[in-house]
Interface confidence: low
């Protein structure tokens, strides 16, 4: 292969220019002619100069995944995805993030502890003996009544178990 | 780019700790988890627990517990793993590994009298 | 702990042909979310592992579409359509679903 300049692609023995970003190449440069660039379609895109004969597909922002889309594709930048409100990603695959999972809801019995942010999940924390959270939402327990032994006993603990993929 | 170096290898007498390092470039240190593996020969790879940078609290292993002590230095962008009370057993290959699929190169303990 | 197992331990195959690894959970790993949190490494000689799939059947960045996951439940199979030369190592599940994470035993490819 030919040793080509950082603005030029090989092309069997040959160097031509690239196509810059927003467009792929359509047809090589030739003896008499430069690169024949053309644009990105809506849906695609090529970040950098590049000799490529087809731009890349935009990535999709699965809201199954818990994602949506942060930043929309443009031609020269691909989409961005984030969190759906409610949710932390848990699987990050290069500078985007996966897949992302709703926060843990606190059982009855436990307070929240520290609650979720788009990284990390929510922390749930059994209430000391003698006081109470009827729905696991409060961040504080609350002083007990006749039953707050029943419901710090009987209530499971909770499980905020985050899972670094 | 995200990168974990580790501490060098390090060879201890049984009964002592050892603590060991791994620095992060990059901005593993704001949004995700950071973990530890061991590895040993025939035994293949065993989850130990993680630290959460942002956060200071830890999941463990329960077979871990008592044995590692995960730590970090969020200033310094340095995760620490402490090993204690050490036996032949704990000697391998340790890495820390973060929730972006980093991993460092792995740090060697070899525990000998 | 929920046991994974590998088979076969270890498989010796010729460069551009198929290779076929099989992970067997001791329990479900699909999560009360609906996801399955199953993923598989590699390990080159004398380096640190490197994840290549999740969530089962997903690619990582950068790795090849020769390979592909599959499987649901307790079953599972990392599948490598055409085996490479930088394809030699030991391939490794690593199960999420469940606490602790386990990992499968290793399969180890070898090129004949």
């Known amino acids: 292969l030919p040793s080509c300049k950082e603005d030029e692609y090989p092309v069997g023995s040959e160097c031509c220019p690239k196509c810059g970003p927003g467009f792929h190449v359509r047809q090589a440069c030739g003896e008499q002619t430069g690169t024949v660039c053309e644009p990105c379609s809506p849906g695609t895109y090529i970040a950098h100069f590049n000799g490529l004969s087809k731009c890349l597909q935009c990535q999709m922002c699965d809201p199954a995944m818990g994602l949506r889309t942060s930043r929309n594709c443009s031609t020269t930048a691909n989409a961005l995805c984030g969190c759906s409100p409610g949710h932390f990603c848990i699987i990050q695959d290069g500078d985007h993030c996966a897949a992302c999972r709703a926060y843990a809801t606190s059982s009855p019995g436990q307070r929240v502890q520290k609650g979720g942010t788009e990284s990390q999940d929510t922390l749930c924390q059994n209430c000391p003996p003698g006081t109470f959270s009827s729905n696991g939402t409060l961040e504080e327990c609350q002083h007990g009544t006749k039953c707050s032994k029943w419901l710090v006993t009987e209530a499971g603990p909770g499980t905020s178990s985050f899972r670094w993929v | 780019q995200v990168q974990l170096q580790q501490s060098g290898a390090e060879l201890v007498r049984p009964g002592t700790s050892v603590k060991i390092s791994c620095k992060a470039s990059?901005?593993?240190?704001?949004?995700?988890?950071l973990g530890w593996i061991k590895q040993r020969p025939g035994h293949g790879l065993e989850w130990i627990g993680d630290?959460?940078?942002?956060?200071?609290?830890?999941k463990y292993n329960e077979k871990f517990k008592g044995k590692a002590t995960l730590t970090i230095d969020t200033s310094a962008s340095t995760a620490y793993m402490q090993l204690s009370r050490l036996t032949s057993e704990d000697s391998g290959v340790y890495f820390c590994?973060?929730?972006?699929?980093?991993w460092g190169q792995g740090t060697s303990v070899t525990v000998s009298s | 702990d929920v046991v994974m197992t590998q088979t076969p331990l270890t498989l010796s195959v010729t460069i551009g042909q198929p290779a076929s690894i099989s992970c067997k959970s001791s329990?479900?790993?699909?999560?009360?979310?609906?996801?399955?949190?199953l993923n598989w490494l590699l390990q080159r000689p004398g380096q640190s592992p490197k994840r290549l799939i999740y969530?089962?059947?997903k690619l990582d960045s950068g790795v090849p579409d020769r390979f592909t996951g599959s499987g649901s439940g307790t079953d599972f199979t990392l599948k490598i359509s055409r085996v490479e030369a930088e394809d030699l190592g030991v391939y490794y599940c690593?199960?999420?679903?469940?606490?602790?994470?386990?990992f499968g035993g290793g399969t180890k490819l070898e090129i004949k």
């Open positions: 590994a973060g929730a972006m699929d980093y």
């Open positions: 990059g901005n593993i240190f704001t949004n995700s988890w």
């Open positions: 630290v959460y940078p942002g956060g200071g609290y830890n």
């Open positions: 329990q479900s790993l699909l999560d009360s979310d609906g996801k399955t949190y």
């Open positions: 969530l089962v059947s």
């Open positions: 690593w199960q999420l679903t469940h606490f602790p994470q386990t």
